[in-house]
Amino acid sequence: QPEQKTLSLPGTYRHVDRTTGQVLTCDKCPAGTYVSEHCTNMSLRVCSSCPAGTFTRHENGIERCHDCSQPCPWPMIERLPCAALTDRECICPPGMYQSNGTCAPHTVCPVGWGVRKKGTENEDVRCKQCARGTFSDVPSSVMKCKAHTDCLGQNLEVVKPGTKETDNVCGMRLFFSSTNPPSSGTVTFSHPEHMESHDVPSSTYEPQGMNSTDSNSTASVRTKVPSGIEEGTVPDNTSSTSGKEGTNRTLPNPPQVTHQQAPHHRHILKLLPSSMEATGEKSSTAIKAPKRGHPRQNAHKHFDINEH
């Protein structure tokens, strides 16, 4: 045996000289090498570099380096290569997570849903319904719900209130002198005060990343249509400043689109599990009426999924 189980000083190991039977204390070899010749009464131990395909992580007294793990099976990629100092380490590529020994695509949160928790190489994305005052108009595995454009803050009118799937549509304000109220034929864009924002069902899917709270979704590419979840499309806020009861329904598993969306880095937010997220502040420059307010890319440094 190259190493005895007896105590030895740090940085040394015990070796029994096979010819004399004498127990010798030898210096260990550094990480990335192994003991090609043990020490004797007359000589120091000899270290050699680990051959290709093998490694040692720590200083040691072993006579042979450890074999590296097998090459990463598709679609995994190497996080660390097999080298003298490190074993090969495989991880799922960006946009995928490890599930049952293989890689599955991150759930894509559907329109009307945003990312509540971003995915990692070991955990799927968690989706949530966009809450009052927020929306998501593209399927994405990285974007949070974004706040509706603040039309009033830009001195514009809400021509069409946003929903959880669409932004507010802003238009030029119509100014009338106090002495000349608008005639009955003039169109002014009023803001209904009590429209249920998500009460008009449309699609009924739930993204996979919304399974039980403490569950990690295990799935391969999913495109499933969960049961019983309505994706309402009624206005979520009457105006930026006076919103209606928007909904932030959190579908347990919004449908997933299996393709990955380019990170649009738009913000979303969640409050109670769903609506308190994201802080995307945005502004849209609508000059002509009507114009859809485009949230500007958040100036937030991190594109934390939960953020954008």
Epitope: Q129, L271, L272, M276
Partner: antibody, heavy 115, light 110 residues
């Protein structure tokens, strides 16, 4: 008009159980995430639990995890909170709230845990 | 101890401007929207501000919200006696994976 009406509160001994209900009306209940938030006497608001519109995902505060269970019956427009192994520190007014933004709240129901 | 820090109290005379702060961290306010709730004595909380600075219909424009970095604030201009209440800020916390509330601020109209 959106209305949330909690019920089921009362006096219970430590270790006991209680089931709170929240009857919703005035909106499409099945479209909304719902939550329970509590307020101990003279204290601030504390989020307790939330459930997605279909019931597929639930979230719990660490202080109640493993003891409380949130559920909903969309056919009855009702939200529930099953509270087991109750402790004195669970004494509070329990509110149900609508949407992730908690845009509407019920009037609350008082739960007193005392021997 | 709350993840969001609010001053326990604030006060002002009628007509004055009062500001309530809410301090958090990158994992909550810094990365998520802020909500404010008003709780009048003996009543349930009511949503006052959502997504940092938006008011639900029916909320007077005397109330305004703002957010900067990891802090948020609620301003009440033209303070009125009916504004005497407890005010709470709230947001989502990415690290806790849960919503969090501030400890609340009691506003007194002198």
């Amino acid at each position: 008009e959106v209305q949330l009406l909690e019920s089921g509160g009362g006096l219970v001994q430590p270790g006991g159980s209680l089931r709170l209900s929240c009857a919703a009306s005035g909106f499409t209940f099945s479209n909304y995430e719902m939550s329970w938030v509590r307020q101990a006497p003279g204290k601030g608001l504390e989020w307790v639990s939330s459930i997605y519109s279909s019931g597929g995902e639930t979230l719990y505060a660490d202080s109640v995890k493993g003891r409380f269970t949130i559920s909903r019956d969309n056919s009855k427009n009702t939200l529930y909170l099953q509270m087991n192994s109750l402790r004195a520190e669970d004494t509070a007014v329990y509110y149900c709230a609508r949407d992730g933004a908690a845009d509407y709240w019920g009037q609350g129901t008082l739960v007193t845990v005392s021997s | 101890q709350s993840e969001l820090t609010q001053p326990p109290s604030a006060s002002g005379t009628p007509g004055q401007w009062v500001t309530i702060s809410c301090s958090g961290s990158t994992s909550n306010i810094g990365n998520n929207y802020v909500y404010w709730y008003q709780q009048l004595p003996g009543t349930a909380p009511k949503l006052l501000i959502y997504t940092n600075n938006q008011r639900p219909s029916g909320v007077p424009d005397r109330f305004s919200g703002s957010k900067s970095g990891t802090s948020a604030s609620l301003a009440i201009s033209g303070l009125r006696s009916e504004d005497e209440a407890d005010y709470y800020c709230a947001t989502w916390d990415d690290s806790l994976y849960a919503p969090v509330f501030g400890g609340g601020t009691k506003v007194t109209v002198l």
